[in-house]
């Protein structure tokens, strides 16, 4: 199964500046951290902190580094081979449904419900009904969800789909 890579903004490159390293493509491809020249004869390095490429490629331009929004913290900076990794600040989270912004976690559960999961950068607090053990959404939670709160998934580059 393919790794599905989402569309990103191009970082326009002018004619390669003297400090940009050039090398020859291998099998028509350039290594991570580089893009290919228009004529396909040269690999040109991406600019550290400005743009990047993650795989062997024949991109005409490296990909523009993501800038973390206000309300996000930078876990790791952009390098020539890896995009910036951003994460929501403490007390906020990003849902898969609305990845464009960090939302404030709720401070507590509604009346008649008990907290079973903490606020993480990936999820709001989780509440279940005291009696029935059902989630706020009405779903019946898996047994482990009523016992522990998930630590969340590893942080990933916060580049958004285009």
């Amino acid at each position: 199964e393919s790794a599905l890579i989402t569309q990103q903004d191009l970082a326009p490159q002018q004619r390669a500046a003297p400090q940009q390293k050039r090398s020859s493509p291998s099998e028509g491809l350039c290594p991570p951290g580089h893009h290919i020249s228009e004529d396909g004869r040269d690999c040109i390095s991406c600019k550290y902190g400005q743009d990047y490429s993650t795989h062997w490629n024949d991109l005409l331009f490296c990909l523009r580094c993501t800038r973390c929004d206000s309300g996000e913290v930078e876990l790791s900076p952009c390098t020539t081979t890896r995009n910036t990794v951003c994460q929501c600040e403490e007390g906020t989270f990003r849902e898969e449904d609305s990845p464009e912004m960090c939302r404030k976690c709720r401070t507590g559960c509604p009346r008649g419900m008990v907290k079973v999961g903490d606020c993480t950068p990936w999820s709001d607090i989780e509440c279940v009904h005291k009696e029935s053990g059902t989630k706020h959404s009405g779903e019946v939670p898996a047994v482990e969800e009523t016992v522990t709160s998930s630590p969340g998934t590893p942080a990933s580059p916060c580049s958004l789909s285009g």
Epitope: S2, Q7, W56, D58, L60
Partner: nanobody, 126 residues
Framework: EVQLLESGGGLVQPGGSLRLSCAAS????????VGWFRQAPGKGREFVSA????????YYADSVKGRFTISRDNSKNTVYLQMNSLRPEDTAVYYC???????????????????WGQGTLVTVSS
């Protein structure tokens, strides 16, 4: 921003033919190679074919070799996929892709792409 637009999908009987088109707007395709992937219902996205827009070198998945032909018209910024002898197992959403990504330089099959079209549905059924 690179934008890819597919067209040409539809319903066809087994043994029939279709031609898919992929047109690039914006700053052309953003890469030298352009390819096609497909995703059948309930399955992962798989590589179908690719073409080098500079010299016309072509690449095919074993499952479509001899039946599908990829071509390009650089003056129209368009890449085509001619699909002949279609089979029910070719039923899928077909995606045009650019900025193909490979784990190694010698690999013939990309693991993904930077730029994707919205997809066009091809249904092979009698």
């Amino acid at each position: 921003e690179v934008q890819l637009l597919e067209s040409g999908g539809g319903l066809v009987q087994p043994g029939g033919s279709l031609r898919l088109s992929c047109a690039a707007s914006g700053r052309t395709f953003g890469s030298i190679r352009v390819g096609w992937f497909r995703q059948a219902p309930g399955k992962g996205r798989e590589f179908v074919s690719a073409i080098n827009r500079n010299d016309g070198t072509t690449y095919y998945a074993d499952s479509v070799k001899g039946r599908f032909t990829i071509s390009r018209d650089n003056s129209k910024n368009t890449v085509y996929l001619q699909m002949n002898s279609l089979r029910p197992e070719d039923t899928a959403v077909y995606y045009c892709a650019a900025g193909l990504q490979y784990n190694r330089a010698a690999d013939r099959v990309p693991v993904g792409a930077v730029y994707w079209g919205q997809g066009t549905l091809v249904t092979v059924s009698s």
